[in-house]
């Protein structure tokens, strides 16, 4: 239903502070250098005409569209030119070329330093001091440095750290207690982000249709007991919240999500058996609860479909009369049948059965020639199933931190092009799958392993994007979304790349490295193994683990050692001259 | 080709116990479902049990307690451990195993319960 002022129906029904957390993020997603303070500014500003508009809907600018109030706000801030630069010509546009502007100047790699945790005492006392500023600095930082994240899930986050923070300030121990419970929150939210961030890139790429299908396809594998109405009615809503959220409309985005919450709740007999949890939960959880909800028992008598799909004479018939719903039929009884399969690969599938038809429903014989489709499954079938055997067997033989390494090397091969920064960044990420996924049951592999990939390469290739460098990086980047993964893993050696020249300063370290965390040590290991494998692409496995032994024995040698300095200046140059010739 | 081959079936006491093992031979690949089923003398062909891909279970409500229905992936496998056996149980047992392409069945085996 129309509202006579939009501002003042999402006031209402989101509340005041979910309706101020989600304006700081928008701000906060399109002005990604602003301080927290010049976005706080901003929020209050708006919230204060929202309560103006909902005491009068009739008063002056409450009738106008929220991109409109927003972009306004946005382009009166001061030097803005200064600060952003081109960004500042989007003000000179209307709605609604103006707001896509703005999206198009989202930066998915700013330039702003890592997001560092205060220690516990100092984070407890801004907590305590005003947990409302301490909460919009979560927000503000975390957006900005992830300009698509799900900002309905990002208010969720919030509450947790919020949550968290409440328990830990009042034990003794403050700091175990935080550490792993927000590096906990953390890693979900850097995965939560990547996983958007597919989404927003699907949508912008391919449109909605292509969303549709994925969400069609996972649906279908968490709910297969609902029906195919009910499926396309909830692929439908999922598919409008996350198109609103990618573009920007955060308020409409979160409210039809509690809508799409309160639907799910309200129909649980023909949707799961499983919701009911989630159900007993407030907005926030319910919402992120419902999203990861375990899949419904299979039904435990499907048939085959065979007879509907390959066997039935009006295939060609039924397929031409309303193409996407019986392919999206197909999606739906192919999925609900495959839990144990990711996303990508259905996708893959249905992809393949469309294909098959186009060419066979224009034949002289079309049930002679689409007669064998679904045998010529099995290849797509059997390729992601060695992918995760292969790659969760080397997990389990390697560890996390070598099976990093692995892909390290083996991306660095594939793309030597790409900055070491990014190449490491990819390989701990794409490393982490296996402790993430290769400990699940067998049936929960495949589409761990394969989906959470695919997310990740489509940050690489969001970030090649930016500067193209590679001729392999662009020919899987600019493929479909559901071919990339398969794209990458059939990469080998670039043999058009001229190797690096040596640099012993490359391979130099200093004694500082020894006080630095865990995970900075390994970063500057991994980007000296990339930096190798660009040296000598063509090193095997052998040479380059003699080298990174070496290496590690030096570094634990010279940390150890009374005069640090002297061990890391007199033993580096002689660690140099053995990389050299072990690499020689 | 696929072949499906079960074994195990046989006579036995009531409260007496039998393993059904069934193995399927040939290229089968993307199993969704399997399952057992059973005929007595002059009845329909009724599901006994059924194992899903997720590893979700079914019984028939007159085996529940007694029966248990396991998979083995790698082997393509599926048994029925039937304990506490019934006269009522006495029937050929079928094993079939599904995937999007088809359904395919066993020859049965018999199993009789009988003092």
């Known amino acids: 239903e129309a509202h006579k002022s939009e501002i003042a129906h999402r006031y209402n029904d989101l509340g005041e502070q979910h309706f101020k957390g989600l304006v700081l993020i928008a701000f906060s997603q399109y002005l990604q250098k602003c301080s927290y303070d010049e976005h706080a500014k901003l929020v209050q500003e708006v919230t204060d005409f929202a309560k103006t508009c909902v005491a009068d809907e009739s008063a002056a600018n409450c009738d106008k569209s929220l991109h409109t109030l927003f972009g306004d706000k946005l382009c009166a801030i001061p030097n803005l030119r200064e600060n952003y630069g081109e960004l500042a010509d989007c003000c000179t546009k209307q709605e609604p070329e103006r707001n896509e502007c703005f999206l198009q100047h989202k930066d998915d790699n700013p330039s702003l330093p890592p997001f560092e945790r205060p220690e516990a005492e100092a984070m407890c006392t801004s907590f305590k001091e005003n947990p409302t500023t301490f909460m919009g600095h979560y927000l503000h930082e975390v957006a900005r440095r992830h300009p698509y994240f799900y900002a309905p899930e990002l208010l969720y986050y919030a509450e947790q750290y919020n949550e968290i923070l409440t328990q830990c300030c009042a034990e003794a121990d403050k700091e175990s207690c935080l550490t792993p419970k927000l590096d906990g929150v953390k890693e979900k939210a850097l995965v939560s982000s990547v996983r958007q961030r597919m989404k927003c890139s699907s949508m912008q790429k391919f449109g909605e249709r292509a969303f549709k299908a994925w969400a069609v396809a996972r649906l279908s594998q968490t709910f297969p007991n609902a029906d195919f109405a009910e499926i396309t009615k909830l692929a439908t809503d999922l598919t409008k919240v996350n198109k609103e959220c990618c573009h920007g409309d955060l308020l409409e985005c979160a409210d039809d999500r509690a809508e799409l919450a309160k639907y799910m709740c309200e129909n649980q007999a023909t949707i799961s058996s499983k919701l009911q949890t989630c159900c007993d939960k407030p907005l926030l959880k319910k919402a992120h609860c419902l999203s990861e909800v375990e899949h419904d028992t299979m039904p435990a008598d499907l048939p085959a479909i065979a007879a509907d799909f390959v066997e039935d004479q009006e295939v060609c018939k039924n397929y031409a009369e309303a193409k996407d719903v019986f392919l999206g039929t197909f999606l739906y009884e192919y999925s609900r049948r495959h839990p144990d399969y990711s996303v990508s690969l259905l996708l893959r599938l249905a992809k393949k059965y469309e294909a098959t038809l186009e060419k066979c429903c224009a034949e002289a014989n079309p049930p002679a020639c689409y007669g064998t489709v679904l045998a010529e499954f099995q290849p797509l079938v059997e390729e992601p199933k060695n992918l995760v055997k292969t790659n969760c067997d080397l997990y389990e033989k390697l560890g996390e931190y070598g099976f990093q390494n692995a892909i390290l090397v083996r991306y660095t091969q594939k793309a030597p092009q790409v900055s070491t920064p990014t190449l490491v960044e990819a390989a701990r990420n794409l490393g982490r799958v296996g402790t993430k996924c290769c400990t699940l049951p067998e049936d929960q592999r495949l589409p761990c392993v394969e989906d959470y990939l695919s997310a990740i390469l489509n940050r690489v290739c969001l970030l090649h994007e930016k500067t193209p460098v590679s001729e392999h990086v662009t020919k899987c980047c600019s493929g479909s979304l559901v071919e990339r993964r398969p794209c990458f893993s059939a990469l080998t050696v670039d043999e058009t790349y001229v190797p690096k020249e040596f640099k012993a300063e490359t391979f130099t370290f200093h004694s500082d490295i020894c006080t630095l965390p865990e995970k900075e040590k390994q970063i500057k290991k991994q980007t000296a193994l990339a930096e190798l494998v660009k040296h000598k692409p063509k090193a095997t496995a052998e040479q380059l683990k003699t080298v990174m032994d070496d290496f590690a024995q030096f570094l634990d040698t010279c940390c150890k050692a009374a005069d640090k300095d002297t061990c890391f200046s007199t033993e580096g140059p002689n660690l140099v001259t053995r990389c050299k010739d072990a690499l020689a | 080709q696929v072949q499906l081959q079960e074994s195990g079936g046989g006579l036995v006491q009531p409260g007496g116990s039998l393993r059904l093992s069934c193995v399927a031979s040939?290229?089968?690949?993307?199993?969704?479902?399997m399952g057992w089923y059973r005929q007595a003398p002059g009845k329909q062909r009724e599901l006994v049990a059924s194992i899903t891909v997720d590893g979700s279970t079914h019984y028939a409500d007159t085996v529940k307690g007694r029966f248990t229905i396991s998979k083995d992936n790698a082997a393509n496998m599926v048994y029925l451990q039937m304990n506490a056996l019934e006269p009522e149980d006495t029937a050929v047992y079928y094993c079939?195993?599904?995937?999007?392409?088809?359904?395919?069945w066993g020859q049965g085996t018999q199993v009789t319960v009988s003092s």
């Open positions: 079939d195993i599904r995937n999007v392409g088809g359904d395919y």
């Open positions: 040939g290229s089968i690949w993307g199993i969704y479902h």
